[in-house]
Interface confidence: low
């Protein structure tokens, strides 16, 4: 069964290569365990960037991923991806799975286009 997942269509990464965006879903029932996966779509291929499981007690996720972090609050996840470079510009999709208790629900957002601009190198200065 499907749930509606919403995320912003466009986000500009900071000059430090950090992009943050919310991923929200329409809760269908009280859920003890929510799995959130960030996927990057390039052409017809989906690549998993990071994934985590949130619970009522574990509201900070992606501890196994150095480039992802996120916090969970009811039906909203605030996602942050860091270490981004210009080559990482692309469409990032948020997938939400209501894992437990049943019934199982899944939903995928339409994706957030993250634009990353590499900072210009600082010119050497002779002082």
């Amino acid at each position: 069964e499907a749930i509606q997942v919403t995320q912003p269509s466009v986000v500009l990464a900071s000059s430090h290569g950090v992009a943050s965006f919310p991923c929200e879903y329409s809760p269908s029932h009280n859920t003890d365990e929510v799995r959130v996966t960030v996927l990057r779509q390039t052409n017809d291929q989906m690549t998993e960037v990071c994934a985590t499981t949130f619970t009522e007690k574990n509201t900070v996720g992606f501890l196994d991923y150095p480039f992802c972090s996120g916090t969970f609050n009811e039906s909203r996840v605030n996602l942050t991806i860091q270490g981004l470079r210009a080559v990482d510009t692309g469409l990032y999709l948020c997938k939400v799975e209501l894992m437990y208790p049943p019934p199982y629900f899944v939903g995928m957002g339409n994706g957030t286009q993250i634009y990353v601009i590499d900072p210009e190198p600082c010119p050497d200065s002779d002082f």
Partner: nanobody, 113 residues
Framework: QVQLVESGGGLAQPGGSLRLSCAAS????????VGWYRQTPGNQREWVAT????????TYADSVKGRFTISRDNAKNTIYLQMNSLKPEDTAVYYC??????WGRGTQVTVSS
């Protein structure tokens, strides 16, 4: 529409093993999580285990943790549930389910001596 067909059930003795299979047709299931559920004789349907899209991640109900193992073969479009150290209370009809499918017919597992 993805169709799921469960198989592999049967009669097992307490302490025995069974391996259930869940074959998908109509679409690939590699991009979705898949769960096993069971319906007990008392008509209570409960969650058993879930395999996430990256098959490295599995989640289990406390009642089966350490005894059951969920796995998937994306090339064969099939999900498995290896059931070891079976107990009489594991007797139920077992179903697999994804977010893309309706409930199938399930496969009956009976644990009895």
């Amino acid at each position: 529409q993805v169709q799921l067909v469960e198989s592999g059930g049967g009669l097992a003795q307490p302490g025995g093993s069974l391996r259930l299979s869940c074959a998908a047709s109509g679409s690939t299931i590699s991009s979705v999580a898949v769960g096993w559920y069971r319906q007990t004789p008392g008509n209570q349907r409960e969650w058993v285990a879930t395999s996430s899209t990256s098959s490295t991640t599995a989640t289990y109900a406390d009642s089966v943790k350490g005894r059951f193992t969920i796995s998937r073969d994306n090339a064969k479009n099939t999900i498995y549930l290896q059931m070891n150290s079976l107990k009489p209370e594991d007797t139920a009809v077992y179903y697999c389910k994804t977010g893309l499918t309706n409930w199938g017919r399930g496969t009956q597992v009976t644990v009895s001596s």
